[in-house]
């Protein structure tokens, strides 16, 4: 039985060209990571975060995504394309996965307000 | 190479208790949960439960809850089942095995310690 | 709690032979399953994982197939140092569960 809540940064938004963090956390389970997978709105995988292995950032990405902080994922030089929807799947042991959904607009505002709160999607 | 190695077999009496070590080599021991395995004499496999090697919380199965308790001891990639209260019925091989696979449609069972035989007699 | 059960518990066969070993689940169980090898007196070692795929030095006679609530271990040409016990496991979430196992004996 699925005991565990993904928490996650929920809607937010960020200014183009700047950056922004992108954190899930699981809770509420005795279940033990094992692997945090992040996906674009596309299904194309960002990054990997193995317990083994550590991190692995995509090429595509590599120059605009940098890990952390903890199981997250910092986009950095913002453009327009990447407002969307974005994932954190969670491999955990003996659970199962448990999946996050984080929706980022980019603004073209330099006005644009970053909020990042926490809430269970 | 990656390796369980277990303590060795044990002769209790009843109402005794006994202490399995399994240590671990070979790879990052807090990366992969660890699991407890019985297998009674004549009899098949019985998963008794696991140990969460991050933040050492175990789990115990319905009927290995009580009197077995799963820890370890990260300074020396060891994890540990201890079953007091020793019964006759106890008497069994026990297993330690690491979950393998980083994904969940991958996880198995992947490497074993060579078991430690626990022989409960008056 | 999802159950396995293994058929048959007894399989007598000749070596050469080839053989199948089937372990259906209570529920669906999507392809969290593995196979599992033990000869008398040591320790299971993996020869199957996600169903259908071949661990790491395991010899290709083996396969696995299947997926939801039906499962198969075939051994295409049975060697000698076949003739031992073989398990099913599920790894669906909480409580992982072995089947009863399957003792493969010369004929």
């Known amino acids: 039985m699925m005991t565990g809540t993904i928490e996650t940064t929920g809607n937010i938004s960020a200014k183009k060209g700047g950056s922004v963090i992108l954190q899930c956390h699981l809770s509420s389970t005795m279940a033990q990571v094992t692997q945090v997978n992040w996906e674009q709105h596309d299904h194309s995988l960002l990054a990997i975060r193995n317990a083994e292995l550590g991190w692995h950032i995509y090429p595509a990405f590599k120059d605009r995504v940098a890990p952390g902080p903890g199981l997250g994922l910092t986009l950095q030089s913002l453009t327009m394309n990447d407002t969307g929807e974005y994932f954190c799947t969670y491999h955990t042991y003996p659970d199962g996965t448990y999946r996050g959904r984080i929706f980022l607009e980019v603004l073209e505002s330099s006005v644009a307000e970053h909020s990042a709160r926490f809430q269970i999607p | 190479e990656v390796q369980l190695v277990q303590s060795g077999s044990d002769l209790k009496k009843p109402g005794a208790s006994v202490r399995v070590s399994c240590k671990a080599s070979g790879y990052t021991f807090t990366s992969y949960p660890m699991n407890w395995v019985r297998q009674a004499p004549g009899h098949g496999l019985e998963w008794m439960g696991w140990?969460?090697?991050?933040?050492?919380?175990?789990t115990y199965v319905q009927g290995f809850t009580g009197r077995f308790v799963f820890s370890l001891d990260t300074s020396v990639n060891t994890a540990y089942l201890q079953i007091s209260s020793l019964k006759a019925e106890d008497t069994a091989v026990y297993f330690c095995?690491?979950?393998?696979?980083?994904?969940?449609?991958?996880?198995?069972?992947?490497?074993w310690g060579q078991g430690t035989m626990v022989t409960v007699s008056s | 709690d999802i159950q396995l059960t293994q058929s048959p518990t007894f399989l007598s066969a000749s070596v050469g032979d080839r053989v199948t070993i089937t372990c259906r689940a209570s529920?669906?169980?999507?392809?969290?399953l593995a196979w599992y090898q033990q000869n008398p007196g040591k320790a299971p070692k993996l020869l199957i994982y996600a169903a259908s795929t071949l661990q790491s030095g395991v010899p290709s006679r083996f396969s696995g197939s299947g997926s939801g609530t039906e499962f198969t271990l075939t051994i295409s040409s049975l060697q000698p140092e076949d003739f031992v016990t073989y398990y099913c496991q599920h790894l669906h979430g909480y409580p992982s569960n072995f089947g009863q196992g399957t003792k493969v004996e010369i004929k």
């Open positions: 140990i969460n090697t991050n933040t050492g919380n175990p």
């Open positions: 529920q669906v169980i999507s392809s969290s």
């Open positions: 095995a690491r979950t393998g696979g980083h994904t969940y449609d991958s996880y198995a069972f992947d490497v």
